[in-house]
Amino acid sequence: LQDLCSNCPAGTFCDNNRSQICSPCPPNSFSSAGGQRTCDICRQCKGVFKTRKECSSTSNAECDCISGYHCLGAECSMCEQDCKQGQELTKKGCKDCCFGTFNDQKRGICRPWTNCSLDGKSVLVNGTKERDVVCGPSPADLSPGASSATPPAPAREPGHSPQ
């Protein structure tokens, strides 16, 4: 009897009520592997979720987040609010990055500016809330009296896409 069920392909289930005949998965359900005794209910993308890929008889639906939110967790199990570049999400909402830290994305945390001296380099372009520093030549490579840091480019939204 087990052998009969193993013949049931993906998109079907082994129907015990019908002498282990392979029956198609009912609407809004799927089986991604063969030999299944039941079909799984399709994921529904509602609320802050939007459908990225429709459910089929052999694969689950895939969700994305609506505009203003980004995915978290495996298979986009959660949606988290976007912040602006130069901010991070806290329990109290979006907060500006503290001095010495930056976030160049709409998600994630404010990170410390890179310590150029770790690599024996100097700061070529100063950091901002939205941008990391750009490291430049080692101080020894700079001509005497030359300024090591140039001011950041004029502030603008570089538009990092949330991932």
């Epitope: 994305q105 994630g108 945390i109 990170r111 500016w113 890179t114 310590n115 150029c116 770790l118 690599d119 380099k121 070529l124 372009v125 990391d132 520093v133 750009v134 490291c135 430049g136 480019a153 603008r156 570089p158 538009g159 990092h160 896409s161 991932q163």
Partner: antibody, heavy 119, light 107 residues
Framework: QVQLVQSGAEVKKPGASVKVSCKAS????????INWVKQAPGQGLEWIGN????????NYNQKFKDKATITADKSTSTAYMELSSLRSEDTAVYYC????????????WGQGTTVTVSS | DIQMTQSPSSLSASVGDRVTITCRPS??????LNWYQQKPDKTVKLLIY???RLRSGVPSRFSGSGSGTDFTFTISSLQPEDIATYFC?????????FGQGTKLEIK
């Protein structure tokens, strides 16, 4: 000196997975982003994604989101990229790179790992 | 995604020639433009970062200029060891993108 040494060439069948490694040495592994870049035969370079090993924060190119999984092991200073459900179009040289003191350019490149997908 | 239009796709020049490659991003990337050299053995090296900054140890015959949406890479006097493919790359906006490359050959 700063070095990224990648694992050897792989030949895989369609539908299989492969995990490429990138071992870092000569610097503090947790302080720099590691990026992965694809170069298909006769083609240009494509950024796949990156990881900040300190907290394993990742970014992905949307194009590779369902294809690549990037991880890092701080204890061995090694970054990994796993490619799943391989197809012939995944045949390429894959490079790991380290940024130049910030994440906007890459001054250290691994030697590349050739992944061939063939039935 | 930002598209990087690099030209020419290939060029042939003589030793001592001045060689120029251009890169045009589809949107303003400030100065976050880098140039890489890929040798025939597939090894890749950063030559220029942040538009015009020569990486330490790179010969001064290599230079870069531009800003916004128009960038230029120049080899002032081509040497035999410069046979390679050159790529531009923007580091302004995720996903970071590369130009299609310029294959440089010696006449």
């Amino acid at each position: 000196q700063v070095q990224l040494v990648q694992s050897g060439a792989e030949v895989k069948k369609p539908g299989a997975s492969v995990k490429v490694s990138c071992k870092a040495s000569g610097y503090t592994f947790t302080s720099y982003w590691i990026n992965w870049v694809k170069q298909a035969p006769g083609q240009g370079l494509e950024w796949i994604g990156n990881i900040y090993p300190s907290d394993s924060y990742t970014n992905y190119n949307q194009k590779f989101k369902d294809k690549a999984t990037i991880t890092a092991d701080k204890s061995t200073s090694t970054a990994y990229m796993e490619l799943s459900s391989l197809r012939s179009e995944d045949t390429a040289v894959y490079y790991c790179t380290r940024d130049y003191g910030s994440s906007y350019s890459y001054n250290v490149w691994g030697q590349g790992t050739t992944v061939t997908v063939s039935s | 995604d930002i598209q990087m239009t690099q030209s020419p796709s290939s060029l042939s020049a003589s030793v001592g020639d001045r060689v120029t490659i251009t890169c045009r991003p589809s949107q303003d990337i400030s100065n976050y433009l880098n140039w890489y050299q890929q040798k025939p053995d597939k090894t890749v090296k950063l030559l220029i970062y942040y538009t015009s900054r020569l990486r330490s140890g790179v010969p001064s015959r290599f230079s870069g200029s531009g800003s916004g949406t128009d960038f230029t890479f120049t080899i002032s006097s081509l040497q035999p060891e410069d046979i390679a493919t050159y790529f531009c790359q923007q580091g302004d906006t995720l996903p970071y993108t590369f130009g299609q490359g310029t294959k440089l050959e010696i006449k």
